[in-house]
Amino acid sequence: YFGKLESKLSIIRNLNDQVLFIDQGNRPLFEDMTDSDCRDNAPRTIFIINMYKDSQPRGMAVAISVKCEKISTLSCENRIISFKEMNPPDNIKDTKSDIIFFQRSVPGHDNKMQFESSSYEGYFLACEKERDLYKLILKKKDELGDRSIMFTVQNED
């Protein structure tokens, strides 16, 4: 069971300081942006981190949404990352959900975060380069200190 606590507005960056945004095709991508670019591209660069408490002691659970014309929420259905047109619900009556990720500090790097899928244990949100695009993907954690699964989350209060 996941019960919603509240939400905050955030800018998410990879460790190369590229900013996560949702493009016109609803794809989550990373791109180099100045602070001015970041503001100019809002709301596509502003993510709503919806915080949930897990009924099992597994930590801070989050759903990540973006509001452009409508609200879309990040999903990892079938281990494929996509944004689905939906509002994060108040309650999720299950122990797993394709839209719920566990947000934790990276040990030894307190300002860095990682997001583990609640549906696929051991799989994390990651940044991966594919041709000329830096994409948000779901990746099985296979090594310690993998920078591709680490992110910074900046409050936009």
């Epitope: 069971y1 996941f2 019960g3 919603k4 606590l5 509240e6 939400s7 905050k8 507005l9 981190i49 915080m51 949930y52 408490k53 897990d54 009924s55 002691p57 597994r58 930590g59 801070m60 108040d90 309650n91 009556k93 947000q103 934790r104 500090s105 040990p107 307190d110 300002n111 975060m113 409050n155 209060d157």
Partner: antibody, heavy 120, light 111 residues
Amino acid sequence: EVQLVESGGGLVQPGGSMRLSCTASGFTFSEYAMSWVRQAPGKGLEWVSGISTGGGGTYYADSVEGRFTISRDNSKNTLYLQMNSLRAEDTAVYYCAKPWLSGSRSGDFWGQGTLVTVSS
Amino acid sequence: QSALTQPASVSGSPGQSITISCTGTSSDVGGYNYVSWYQQHPGKAPKLLIYEVSHRPSGVSDRFSGSKSGNTASLTISGLQAEDEADYYCSSFTSSSSLYVFGTGTKLTVL
């Protein structure tokens, strides 16, 4: 202006029951988890119980698990704490609170507290 | 769940700096950046000083700062003033079956 106003405190005998209420105004109550926090005379703060936005998720400190029940009515902007099988060690000022979680956007709101005294 | 561990008391003279520690575990302080600090004067409700480890709400003096290393969070107060004399509590989100946990509290005396 944000306000949280607690009511329902008072004197109760050990083993008795009491229900606290907290009426919220000045913010969108239904968008936030809420908590009860208590402070025994001369002691520190103790988080007691919390509830999710929709009321489906309820969370308790080990010291009150099974005796206290938290609930909310979003249509009335009201938070409740039903306290059963009260003990002397439950004597405290009970604060209704929306503690910090995601920071300044949502704020950090506390009532002024209501005193619950458990004594024969 | 156990309370987070703080020193029972600290003291300092006006103008000095003091630091209050708050030690937890990887299930609370160490695992999340959701650590906050409160100031409480006698008979008053707690007042938020720091949220998410190091962020100050508007209206809070920049003399108050927060940090975290591993399972220990710290509150530093610089340029101590008489009105800083109060009780200070840390708090953290916890992955246990509860939701939050508070620290044991620290009484600050300004000499």
